[in-house]
Interface confidence: medium
């Protein structure tokens, strides 16, 4: 009995269950490509269990096999609009360190307002997660529109 | 050795692994923009392990961080058919209780037959999740086609 | 103290956590629409924690269910290349063993450039999963455009 | 890396037709695709057309589809650029390139690990 309680009480980090899901809070200034991220309840759905938010940018806390998943939904938008504005591409990758720099997930809008992507891969402890989005259309900011979020896996 | 017997006989339900995987059963009526899911293993592919259905919509049964996803698939569609119906708009939602009742993931076909996305979200015992379906189209109800699921993840 | 030593040193394969993560390799001779594909950390960031390949195709080694996602990019493509040249379509299914055959996803490009999608589906040992690309059309081989996974869910 | 060399180039006037030829020497074990470039004065160079070593699926450049068309004879390590209704603004430089990617992007260059060294083609009255 006491055993299972100390089980009970162990803290869910501990088992490596770190997930994060945000919503987008802004874009960049004119030269800057990437998406600023934000979370918590206060917010609305969003949250963080592990990860953190650096300057907008999502940074890993665990080393692990993570399913990274996201959608944007482009503001205003119609087939014509997102066709007229080609190239229009979404990449997410690891910005730093610098090292460890490599585009992870890649989608172009071509005649869609909307992408949305998810994949398995390996992240480490510090990893920080960039999304970038070329061109010059602007993302909605409806939570249920667009979104950016992580879960981990495996070791 | 008691114990590791013990351990083994604990249902896994027990353990929070809710999951269910849902195929397209019918539309609503006229003004009931709402699909209606079936699942079970007489179907085919499609389960509930926790989860249950309630006319036609899932609800869930554990409090918990889960991975909803979804793919619908126009029926007798083209780029053409989807761009002069536009806009028709899948989303998905809690839409009961009334007092939890929110869109949760939100897309539109424009000149694509299939809309499929994916992200984690709290839910709620009790929470019962919508599909809804604005427009005239109709979604074909191939198993590989369209089909509508949510994944516990995390407490 | 001993008992949670013992604990650490399970594999991970016996908690049930198999995943994978593949690369396109090369697709297939003339009337062959399959995507054959290849993994391992010697060739960037694609992996296989328990399944296996074989002759490109993804084989399963532990009953249960797993969530199946893919993206597929096409190569020097446009809206009017997708157009042009459909139908194309990119179908997941179990090719092997014959008794088990059966489209699992199943997406059309229409207008556009990328597929992606996913799918919680029962999968046994010895499964071997398929990918088939219909038309003439060249998927790109890039790691952030074109990837193929599954993650073990639960029993 | 392979051994690319390029040939079939020449002056043509508008409206006519040429092939290109390029012959592959060396390991194509690990090669994706092959695929034809152009650079034309003044500009980046550009995809035209790639089709697959394995399979000969092919994708197309907007510009040249339904004028162009590429090929390839395995027997003879021979990937083929067939080019009808030429205008004069497919005056380029034509590079023949083996890929182990193949981007989703026209403008992609990246990896294309070997290039041959080029053929002209000028389309003029």
């Known amino acids: 009995q006491r055993f299972a309680q100390a089980q009970q009480q162990l803290p869910l980090e501990s088992l490596g269950w770190d997930v994060a899901e945000l919503q987008l809070n802004h874009t960049g200034p004119q030269q800057d490509p990437r998406l600023y991220w934000q979370g918590g309840p206060a917010l609305g759905r969003s949250f963080l269990h592990g990860p953190e938010l650096d300057k907008g940018q999502l940074r890993i806390h665990r080393d692990g096999i993570y399913m990274v998943h996201i959608q944007v939904t482009l503001a205003i938008c119609s087939s014509t609009t997102a066709s007229r504005h080609h190239p229009t591409t979404l990449a997410v990758g690891i910005c730093s360190p610098a090292s460890r720099s490599i585009s992870l997930l890649r989608l172009s809008f071509h005649q869609g307002c909307t992408i949305a992507s998810q994949r398995l891969t390996p992240l480490a402890r510090g990893d920080t997660l960039c999304t970038n989005l070329t061109g010059t259309l602007l993302p909605s900011r409806n939570t249920d529109e667009t979104f950016f979020g992580v879960q981990w896996v495996r070791p | 050795q008691r114990f590791a017997q013990a351990q083994q006989q604990l249902p896994l339900e027990s353990l929070g692994w809710d999951v269910a995987e849902l195929q397209l059963n019918h539309t609503g009526p006229q003004q009931d923009p709402r699909l209606y899911w079936q699942g079970g293993p007489a179907l085919g592919r499609s389960f509930l392990h926790g989860p249950e259905l309630d006319k036609g919509q899932l609800r869930i049964h554990r409090d918990g961080i889960y991975m909803v996803h979804i793919q619908v698939t126009l029926a007798i569609c083209s780029s053409t058919t989807a761009s002069r119906h536009h806009p028709t708009t899948l989303a998905v939602g809690i839409c009961s209780p009334a007092s939890r009742s929110i869109s949760l993931l939100r897309l539109s076909f424009h000149q694509g037959c299939t809309i499929a996305s994916q992200r984690l979200t709290p839910l709620a015992r009790g929470d019962t999740l919508c599909t809804n379906l604005t427009g005239t189209l109709l979604p074909s109800r191939n198993t590989d086609e369209t089909f509508f699921g949510v994944q516990w993840v995390r407490p | 103290q001993r008992f949670a030593q013992a604990q650490q040193q399970l594999p991970l394969e016996s908690l049930g956590w198999d995943v994978a993560e593949l690369q396109l390799n090369h697709t297939g001779p003339q009337q062959d629409p399959r995507l054959y594909w290849q993994g391992g950390p010697a060739l960037g960031r694609s992996f296989l924690h328990g399944p296996e390949l074989d002759k490109g195709q993804l084989r399963i080694h532990r009953d249960g269910i797993y969530m199946v996602h893919i993206q597929v990019t096409l190569a020097i493509c446009s809206s009017t290349t997708a157009s042009r040249h459909h139908p194309t379509t990119l179908a997941v299914g179990i090719c092997s063993p014959a008794s088990r055959s059966i489209s699992l996803l199943r997406l059309s490009f229409h207008q556009g450039c990328t597929i992606a999608s996913q799918r919680l589906t029962p999968l046994a040992r010895g499964d071997t999963l398929c990918t088939n690309l219909t038309g003439t059309l060249l998927p790109s081989r890039n790691t952030d455009e074109t990837f193929f996974g599954v993650q073990w869910v639960r029993p | 890396q392979l051994q690319l060399v390029e040939s079939g180039g020449g002056l043509v006037q508008p409206g006519g037709s040429l092939r290109l030829s390029c012959a592959v020497s060396g390991r194509t074990s690990s090669t994706y695709a092959m695929a034809w470039f152009r650079q034309a004065p003044g500009k980046e160079r550009e995809i035209v057309a790639v089709?697959?070593?394995?399979?000969?699926?092919?994708a197309y450049a907007d510009s040249v589809k339904g004028r162009f068309t590429i090929a390839k004879d395995s027997a003879k390590n021979t990937v083929y650029l067939q080019m009808n209704s030429l205008k004069p603004e497919d005056t380029a430089v034509y590079y023949c390139a083996a890929d182990s990617e193949v981007s989703s992007s026209s403008e992609g260059q990246y990896g294309y690990e070997s290039w041959g060294q080029g053929t002209q083609v000028t389309v003029s009255s």
């Open positions: 089709i697959t070593w394995s399979g000969g699926r092919t």
